[in-house]
């Protein structure tokens, strides 16, 4: 906490400029008007303030806006955002995607911090759902964002937003998350033709039930082993040897390399040896 001291004569700041970097902390506190700072926040990032000086500027804004900063200030926080705590951010009402982008840019290249997580949470809750533009933005900055959401949070994602999801965005999703996302993807892509549909739905198939896998096996999709390995065990077990052969097409030979791994191992165990022998891969049930 900076002590309240009178501003020395001639030092009162008329605008936010580089001369302020020579001010001591107490001088910044005494000589910079909080309202001036708020209106000229966009200039702060162009000035090489020390961390200590930024602390003073934050303190001034906190005094001016005890109930939380207005969006006009938030949008121009820049590196001052890194000084904010999750508690500070919970007081904000961020509605503009441009504001969100500006703040995410500050944290770019770093892992998602508690501050960023809180900011995103506030933004998404404010919007009521995770719309396509928001999802586009968030996954661009954090490819793993979608998989950081709980199944309950994912349930608010409208099917239309699924078009924004790239395969790499689902890399770290667990089965419970894919269980929620798969029906949305199925709905989003339902009007596509066979081969195009499979390309789009492939990344989501970790949430697919047996019936859908059986249907896909009738469409010559040639599923690769990497996708097959991500399928739900309970969805794979009821598939017949013939259905798996059709589903994988030329990739069926890859089962041999995965015979000790789930879900392939579980599936093999539950097949008749005579049926497995038809594959000619030497799989032992």
């Amino acid at each position: 906490e900076v002590e309240k001291t009178a501003c020395p004569s001639g030092k009162k700041a008329r605008e936010i400029d580089e001369s302020l970097i020579f001010y001591k902390k107490w001088e910044l506190e005494a000589c910079v008007d909080a309202a001036l700072l708020a209106t000229q926040m966009d200039r702060v990032n162009a000035i090489p303030f020390t961390y200590e000086q930024l602390d003073v500027l934050k303190h001034k804004l906190d005094e001016l806006y005890p109930q939380g900063y207005p969006e006009s200030v938030i949008q121009h926080l820049g590196y001052l955002f890194l000084k904010m705590s999750p508690e500070d951010i919970r007081k904000w009402n961020v509605t503009s995607l441009e504001t969100l982008k500006a703040l995410l840019e500050v944290n770019k290249g770093h892992e998602m911090s508690p501050q960023v997580a809180t900011l995103i949470d506030r933004f998404v809750k404010g919007r009521g759902q995770l719309d396509k533009d928001t999802l586009d933005t968030l996954t661009a900055f954090y490819p793993g964002y979608l998989c950081s959401l709980s199944p309950e949070e994912l349930s608010s994602v409208p099917p239309s937003s699924i078009w924004a999801v790239r395969p790499q965005d689902l890399d770290t999703c667990d089965p419970r998350q894919l269980d929620v996302l798969y029906p949305k993807a199925r709905l989003a892509f339902q009007n596509m033709n066979g081969s195009e549909y499979f390309v789009k739905i492939q990344s989501f198939l970790g949430g697919a039930p047996t019936e859908d896998l059986k249907a896909l096996s009738q469409q010559n999709v040639s599923m690769d082993l990497a996708t097959f390995m991500k399928l739900r065990t309970d969805a794979v077990l009821p598939l017949t040897v013939a259905e798996v052969q059709k589903l994988l097409g030329p990739h069926v030979e890859g089962l041999k390399a995965e015979e000790r791994h789930r879900p392939v191992r579980d599936w093999i165990l539950r097949q008749r040896q005579d049926d497995l022998d038809t594959l000619g891969l030497g799989l032992q049930g």
Partner: antibody, heavy 119, light 107 residues
């Protein structure tokens, strides 16, 4: 609900064969989703999986124990058994039988039986 | 074989504390990771399966996360009955392996 109970001698001499049986009650050893495992825990140490059997008779063993282990199943008695040959003091442990549900994990365990290898 | 490395091997905590235990696989195991709790003289009990799914009857203060090689078990608010040893286990590869265990003791 399904319960498991281990039985067998608590003392085995070095170089002999350890034999244990697990009796399944309240359910069938022929369950589609279940495999039946043996897991052991030496005193004061961690858990070591020994192997499993499916009701069809298919088995899978821990590679480090494979040469000494045989697991069998008797569907008529609703039991499965473990034989571990050429035992040494290093095989002294609490031996557990457990059900593994293919969709979850080792969800049901016996209470364990202490087997000491000593002359 | 896939090696499972748990850390820490032991920890001291107080009732009400948030406790985090990590488990690392020597190669990717997708989401095939289970967590067990074992109390002295008792058989282990399944807490979490498939990395993040809560086994029926297990309190919601237990949660799991992770995929690939890095996994976490979290107890949001430690209760007196939670002082025990926790093991991770991979059922992905046929040579099922357990982590070395993490003993959670009273501070």
């Amino acid at each position: 609900q399904v319960q498991l109970q281990e039985s067998g001698p608590g003392l085995v001499k070095p170089s002999e064969t350890l034999s244990l049986t697990c009796t399944v009650s309240g359910g069938s050893v022929s369950s589609y989703y279940s495999t039946w495992s043996w897991i052991r825990q030496p005193p004061g140490k961690g858990l070591e999986w020994i192997g499993y059997i499916y009701y069809s008779g298919s088995t899978n063993y821990n590679p480090s124990l494979k040469s000494r282990v045989t697991i069998s199943v008797d569907t008529s008695k609703n039991q499965f058994s473990l034989k571990l040959s050429s035992v040494t003091a290093a095989d002294t442990a609490v031996y557990y039988c457990a059900r593994e549900d293919a969709l979850t994990g080792f969800d049901i365990w016996g209470q364990g039986t202490m087997v000491t290898v000593s002359s | 074989d896939i090696q499972m490395t748990q850390s820490p091997s032991s920890l001291s905590a107080s009732v009400g504390d948030r406790v985090t235990i990590t488990c690392r696989a020597s190669q990717s195991i997708s989401s095939y990771l289970n967590w067990y709790q074992q109390k002295p003289g008792k058989a282990p009990k399944l807490l979490i399966y498939a990395a993040s799914s809560l086994q029926s009857g297990v309190p919601s203060r237990f949660s799991g996360s992770g995929s690939g090689t890095d996994f976490t078990l979290t107890i949001s608010s430690l209760q007196p009955e939670d002082f025990a040893t926790y093991y991770c286990q991979q059922p992905y590869d046929a040579s099922y392996t357990f982590g070395g265990g993490t003993k959670v003791e009273i501070k």
